[in-house]
């Protein structure tokens, strides 16, 4: 038989299929020219020493065949001896190592078989009633197509699914989308009502990455507040790898999660901006205030579910960097100030509320008076910080208060508000013989005792009715008990404690009377 | 500069009195607050009880820790420049060496002291 003939003898091997996993597959014909036709295949399996032949049958039950050697590719023309205007039936069987194996037929008439070509360049995909929908150009003069697809997970085989029939410029293919893992995809043409056409190869990988965005497995951790009232967030972040199918392995577009961190200041909410968004490589800094940080994953179908975290707010106070004046008309507060054109946020609370009453007052813009101090003025009538009790009071500072990551906290400390002096006046003032000379004066805490760092300390006085002599001692603010001793009987004395602040005298308690009664010997 | 010699420790049985005296040399010592503190074995010192210094009145504002007040009473002399601690009632648990101490510090009834002498023990046995 010539080689360019479809030889019409017995193949020169057994005929004998081995049934083996190994063999051709995937064969393809298809007219390439007016007068020429080409069949292709794949092998699987060691290639060495196979030898592959393309078998054919007439519609008359006659068989021939072509030897192709090593090659997985025969080109023939129409005088080859194969019908090309009447259906025949195609399949290759390949010699290997004494034993045939033989690929799936494949049924058709090859004058009418074109080859069709999968879908080239960029395929879109988007996601459609909880479905994955692609989209892709019809390649040029292939208007007209059956479209399959197969997909598959990095667990799973390739399962196969169908698209429909196409007519149009542009085709489409409605596939289902996996909520949690990533997904491979491909997609493959065949000519349109050709009865038995081939199939095109198969296209290249589609990956395509779950509904749900995997979430990170995040840890923060926030440095301590620095001298420029500023503390670093940093994200101990280990981003979920998400395990790929084998095609979509190493550079995989379509399946990228990009994470984005979502700051919310929740402190001093009277500022303009509360929320910011940042890439979650860049590592902010914060002021000492609280803040919700949500961590955003993201992928080509949109946000995931956010994780929330909660940083408490920085409580270490400074008791003596403010400085709290009390006038008839108002209330006003010094600070050091932190720069030219500052912008400071005032927020207070009273103690032992929930922080969701806290109240904020925002300053214009302003400069260090020539003491180098900030101030915050407060009319009695606004009823800030009024009431006789203790507020915690934090001042917050931005050159750009638009800015949420440029906050800085200059200090927090308690301060009693309304009538302090007169409100820490310690009760309950009592006095109880101890000795012959001595006795124990015991008060209850003052208010002010309920602010830390607030009350300065008690001082005691004790005045001798007699000599009109007083004599004053201070006493620690933890402490609420002192004993007086070297009186002298038969003398009327009385005594009083007051509590003081940094900056406030307090008022003496009601004068308690007492006196040692003279011991009369028998 | 001011030295403090303590005297008058011993061993007693449980329920016995004993009275601590503290001898300190200086011009000032009236302007001195005093205290007493102790150490028992394998803890650190305490605080027992403070006496303040002299006032316009002569009356003088003393402290006890709660554990020994109304068994224990402090008093100074300025004019012999002593500190005594009276005990009485004692208990095993008031076994330590007992440290006088002296302070011109504005809080003075719990620490802050500046000079100290070297102890004397008291034992206390059941």
């Known amino acids: 038989c010539r080689t360019s003939e479809c030889c019409f003898q017995d193949p020169p091997y057994p005929d004998a299929d081995s049934g083996s996993a190994s063999g051709p597959r995937d064969l393809r014909c298809y007219r390439i020219s007016s007068d020429r036709y080409e069949c292709s295949w794949q092998y699987e399996g060691p290639t060495a020493g196979v030898s592959h032949f393309l078998r054919c049958c007439l519609s008359s039950g006659r068989c021939c065949y072509f030897a192709a050697g090593s090659a997985t590719r025969l080109q023939f023309s129409d005088q080859a001896g194969v019908s090309v205007l009447y259906t025949v039936t195609l399949w290759v069987e390949s010699w290997a190592r004494n034993q045939t194996e033989k690929s799936p037929e494949v049924t058709l008439q090859l004058y009418n078989s074109v080859k069709y070509e999968p879908p080239l360049g960029d395929i879109k995909v988007s996601k459609l009633a909880g479905q994955l929908r692609m989209e892709w150009e019809t390649p040029d003069n292939q208007v007209g197509a059956e479209v399959q697809f197969r997909h598959r997970t990095p667990s799973s085989p390739w399962k196969l699914g169908d698209c429909g029939p196409q007519d149009d410029d542009t085709e489409s293919c409605l596939c289902p989308l996996e909520m949690n893992v990533a997904q491979e995809f491909q997609l493959r043409r065949r000519q349109l009502g050709s009865q038995g056409s081939s199939w095109s190869k198969w296209s290249s990988p589609v990956c395509v990455p779950p509904e749900n965005p995997p979430q990170p497995q995040v840890r923060f951790s926030v440095e301590q507040l620095g001298q420029d009232g500023r503390r670093r967030l940093t994200l101990k972040e280990q981003p979920t790898q998400l395990e790929l199918p084998e095609g979509c392995q190493g550079l995989a577009p379509g399946t990228e999660v990009t994470y984005r961190l979502q700051l919310h200041m929740l402190s001093c909410p009277c500022k303009a901006k509360a929320t910011r968004t940042l890439h979650l490589g860049k590592m902010p800094y914060l002021s000492g205030a609280a803040y919700n940080v949500a961590v955003i994953s993201s992928n080509q179908f949109g946000p995931g579910l956010n994780q929330t975290w909660h940083i408490p707010a920085d409580t270490h106070t400074e008791p003596v960097a403010l400085n709290i004046s009390v006038g008839t008309n108002g209330t006003t507060m010094y600070w050091p100030a932190r720069a030219q054109s500052m912008t400071y946020c005032i927020e207070w609370q009273p103690v032992g509320q929930d922080g969701g009453l806290a109240t904020c007052s925002l300053t214009a813009p302003q400069d260090p008076d020539p003491a180098g101090m900030a101030t915050y003025s407060w009319s009695r009538e606004s009823g800030a910080m009024g009431q006789e009790k203790c507020y915690y009071i934090t001042i917050f500072a931005s050159a750009h208060p638009e800015k949420l990551t440029l906050w800085s906290t200059v200090l927090s400390t308690y301060h009693f508000g309304g009538n302090a002096s007169a409100a820490g006046t310690p009760h309950h003032v009592s006095v109880k013989n101890h000795s012959l000379d001595s006795v124990s004066v015991d008060w209850a805490p003052s208010l002010l005792s309920t602010c830390p760092g607030v009350l300065k300390e008690y001082v005691v006085r004790c005045r001798d009715e007699d000599s009109k002599q007083v004599s004053e001692h201070p006493v620690q603010p933890t402490e609420t008990q002192v004993t007086l001793s070297g009186l002298r009987a038969g003398v009327a004395y009385t005594v009083q404690v007051r509590a003081d602040t940094a900056w406030l005298r307090g008022v003496w308690s009601q004068p308690q009377r007492f006196s040692i009664e003279v011991q009369v010997s028998d | 500069q001011v030295q403090l010699v303590e005297s008058g420790g011993g061993l007693v049985q449980a329920g016995a009195s004993l009275r601590l005296s503290c001898a300190a040399s200086?011009?000032?010592?009236?302007?001195?607050?005093m205290g007493w503190f102790r150490q028992a074995p394998g803890k650190e010192r305490e605080f027992v009880a403070a006496?303040?210094?002299?006032?316009?009145?002569?009356?003088?504002?003393?402290n006890y820790k709660d554990a020994v007040r109304g068994r224990f009473t402090i008093s100074r002399d300025n004019a012999k420049n002593t500190v005594y601690l009276q005990m009485s009632s004692l208990k095993p648990e008031d076994t330590a060496v007992y440290y006088c101490?002296?302070?011109?510090?504005?809080?003075?009834?719990?620490?802050?002291?500046?000079?100290w002498g070297q102890g004397t023990q008291v034992t206390v046995s059941s």
């Open positions: 006496i303040s210094g002299g006032t316009p009145n002569n009356i003088y504002y003393t």
């Open positions: 101490g002296a302070t011109m510090g504005r809080y003075w009834n719990t620490g802050g002291y500046d000079y």
């Open positions: 200086g011009r000032t010592f009236s302007s001195y607050a």
